[in-house]
């Protein structure tokens, strides 16, 4: 192009021909003058190449589809003219410079100049012939080439081709493969697959973080956020790709024989040019293991007879226990307890072991103890199980000194009540004061039914009637009568019999 | 003409430092994306890493990952590997080369060797 | 990493002789593209090595016509219609789908 000057100012350089383009046959004379008082050089450019000539005529005698390109000249004022040159040859259409990079969003040029700039259909065209992406749009430039419009991932290792029809005829370049490079729109995922460790000196700690990207180029590391002393940790990295643009990388870090010192909070880090994320792992170590039982609400238990309890204990253990075992009044082993590890705990070493007592009968209260252990230490808790009975009248007699006896047995410990009713009435109301009232030691053990004995002075009734014993607590409640007849003025019979009142 | 011309290899003791160049003649530097890949003495090729064109992308084999740092200066036409904390399994002929439009190594210069021994 | 097993790693041929070498990978190197990002080399006795097939089957240029390549996922094969003596190397396939991996090599001796 030669633009002209305004008067006054230097006049940018005259080339000959006289024209912004120029068509020459392959074989033919390229000859271009350039008419300045102050000229340089000439300069020629085309893809990667750019050649300088300090004569004003430049003459190319044997002209060749390379030699296509942008021709300069340049004044000592540092004004410039350009004129393009096409050197047209039936064997090369286009020129080619490889290789073809693109970034995800922007534009990329396929550079694939023309030689002949009197083509139809210059385009691009998939290598094998299959359709291109229908979202590829495209722009093409005779001198520089074929801009693909807004470059997508989807377009990564694309194999195209620019093509062109001459005289009716396609011709096409050598092949394209776009390589295309992610655009960060994200930062980096992170993960650890556990976010505390509990490990015994001497123990390996080994923690691995997967790092997730679209590409190679993320940054990531293992930090020791503590200030005490850097353990003696190694990282080891494996990496793949899960697809073009799916890339993992493992970050294992490793502490092989861990002291109390080494306990602290690990950092797993990364970060690319979008931002940067993290994940924290809690290292802690101890000098030995153990075994804490977390308090029970209550370890006094009662439960009504024939009815079902479970004993819960949860504890915490590192190393797991090795034992674990249920003791029925420190003698007798039962079943061993369903044990299981309370799984919303990430470092796993809270347990829980429940011992299921079905049906139980009276005779079935006592000391239940879970025992527990490890390679290191051992605890235990007990439970105190008692068993709530309905009373149960054992023995209701006249005894040789004129009282009627009652004798009842249950958990709580029974109360004895007695009432008396005449002939007449449906049910005993009138309360008869006991003279007597004794609590016997049913058992040994603590846990057993309570005997109660209570008795009254038969003597104190004056009419035919009926005496009730009944016998009650929590539970339930039992009765027993006495039925007796006055003749003269002696009693002439009394015969108990018993009335069990739900 | 066209070549690669590695140098800055040598014998090196564990836990050093070593800084190879890669200078390339004959073609646009600047278009193609560069490999280091080397080779242990009696042992076949193993990759390193690569640079892409324009210096943006980086990526290496995880052995050296975090050690060793590549990088270019287009002006000059020179590809670097900067390896820290040299061990004696990196002993090798380094050799660099450029990957062509279809990703295989089309171009390879002739190698440096870097011993790294106590 | 995508893992390259070369068979067999030693190769005595007479010359004149066709040989062959075997490659398989561990999963398969053939991209939604079409291409199998699979390329061999040959590494002359105290050479660099050269390029000699690149996506599979495709001759590198001043290779001559003798070599050529086939394959498709996960085996690939090499093959040298008619051995000469300066054939002689160490040939690798390399895998250039993911992050980049070489075989063992294959040393071909003349007998």
């Known amino acids: 192009s030669q633009p002209s000057a305004s008067p006054g100012e230097p006049s940018p350089p005259s080339i000959q021909p006289a024209q912004s383009e120029l068509i020459v046959e392959a074989g033919d004379t390229i000859r271009l003058t350039c008419t300045d008082p102050a000229f340089v050089k000439w300069t020629f450019e085309i893809l990667d190449v750019r050649i300088e000539n300090k004569q004003s005529e430049w003459i190319r005698e044997k002209a060749e589809a390379t030699h296509t390109g942008k021709y300069t000249c340049v004044s000592g004022s540092g004004l410039r003219s350009s004129i393009y040159v096409f050197v047209r040859d039936p064997a090369v259409l286009f020129l080619v410079g490889l290789p073809l990079f693109g970034k995800e969003d922007n534009d990329a040029l396929v550079r694939c100049p023309l030689t002949d700039p009197q083509v139809s259909n210059y385009s691009l065209i998939e290598c094998d012939g299959k359709s291109l992406p229908t979202d590829l749009k495209f722009v093409p430039n005779p001198k520089a080439g074929i801009t693909i419009k807004n470059v997508k991932r989807a377009y990564h290792r694309l194999c195209i081709r620019c093509a062109a029809q001459r005289e009716g005829k396609w011709m096409r370049s050598d092949k394209f493969t776009l390589k295309v490079r992610a655009a960060i729109k994200a930062i980096p995922v992170v993960s650890v697959p556990e976010t505390s460790h509990l490990l015994k000196e001497g123990d390996t700690f080994t923690v691995i973080c997967t790092i997730k990207d679209v590409s190679t180029s993320v940054d990531s590391m293992w930090i020791k956020l503590n200030p005490q002393p850097q353990s003696k940790a190694q990282v080891k990295r494996n990496s793949w790709h899960q697809g073009d643009f799916n890339y993992e990388r493992q970050e294992t870090l490793t502490i092989s024989s861990a002291r109390v010192n080494d306990s602290g909070v690990f950092m797993c880090y990364a970060n690319n040019t979008f931002g940067s994320a993290n994940v924290t792992t809690t290292l802690k170590v101890v000098e030995k293991g153990f075994i804490n039982i977390f308090p029970v609400k209550n370890t006094t238990v009662f439960v009504t007879d024939g009815e079902n309890v479970d004993l819960v204990v949860e504890f915490e253990a590192y190393p797991k226990p090795e034992h674990q075992q249920w003791i029925y009044m420190n003698r007798t082993p039962t079943n061993r307890g369903e044990d299981y590890v309370k799984s919303d705990n990430q470092s796993n070493i809270r347990y829980v072991n429940e011992l299921r007592l079905t049906r139980l009968k009276g005779t079935e209260g006592g000391t239940y103890t879970f025992l527990v252990s490890n390679s290191d230490v051992s605890a235990s808790v007990t439970f105190d199980v008692y068993v709530n009975t309905k009373p149960e009248i054992l023995t209701y007699d006249r005894l040789m000194n004129g009282r009627l006896q009652c004798v009842a047995a249950g958990f709580p410990e029974p109360t004895i009540d007695w009432y008396f009713c005449t002939g007449a009435e449906q049910r005993c109301t009138v309360p008869v004061p006991p003279v007597d009232v004794q609590i016997q030691n049913a058992s040994v053990s603590p846990f057993g039914k309570l005997v109660v004995q209570s008795s009254i002075d038969s003597s104190v009734f004056r009419h035919n009637g009926t005496v009730e014993c009944k016998a009650s607590n929590a539970v339930g409640k039992s009765s027993a009568f006495f039925n007796f007849a006055f003749k003269g003025n002696s009693k002439e019979q009394i015969q108990p019999h018993t009335l069990f009142t739900p | 003409q066209v070549q690669l011309v590695e140098s800055g290899g040598g014998v090196v003791q564990p836990g050093r430092s070593l800084r190879l160049s890669c200078a390339a003649s004959g073609f646009t530097f600047s278009r193609y994306g560069m490999h280091w890949v080397r080779q242990a003495p009696g042992k076949g090729l193993e990759w390193v890493a690569v640079?892409?064109?324009?210096?943006?992308?980086?990526d290496y084999t995880d052995s050296v990952r975090g050690r060793f740092t590549i990088s270019r200066d287009n002006s000059k036409n020179t590809l670097y590997l900067q390896m820290n904390s040299l061990r004696a399994e990196d002993t090798a002929v380094y050799y660099c080369a450029r990957e062509d439009w279809a990703e295989a190594f089309d171009m390879w210069g002739q190698g440096t060797t870097v011993t790294v021994s106590s | 990493d995508i893992v390259m097993t070369q068979s067999p790693l030693s190769l005595p041929v007479t010359p004149g002789e066709p040989a062959s070498i075997s490659c398989r990978s561990s999963?398969?190197?053939?991209?939604?593209?079409?291409?199998?990002?699979l390329d061999w080399y040959l590494q002359k006795p105290g050479q660099s090595p050269q390029l000699l097939i690149y996506l599979g089957s495709n001759r590198a240029s001043g290779v001559p016509d003798r070599f050529s390549g086939s394959g498709s996922g996960t085996d690939f094969t090499l093959k040298i219609s008619r051995v000469e003596a300066e054939d002689v190397g160490v040939y690798y396939c390399?895998?250039?789908?993911?992050?980049?991996?070489f075989g063992q090599g294959t040393r071909l001796e003349i007998k």
């Open positions: 390399m895998q250039a789908l993911q992050t980049i991996t």
């Open positions: 999963q398969s190197l053939l991209h939604s593209n079409g291409y199998n990002y």
């Open positions: 640079i892409w064109y324009d210096g943006t992308n980086k």
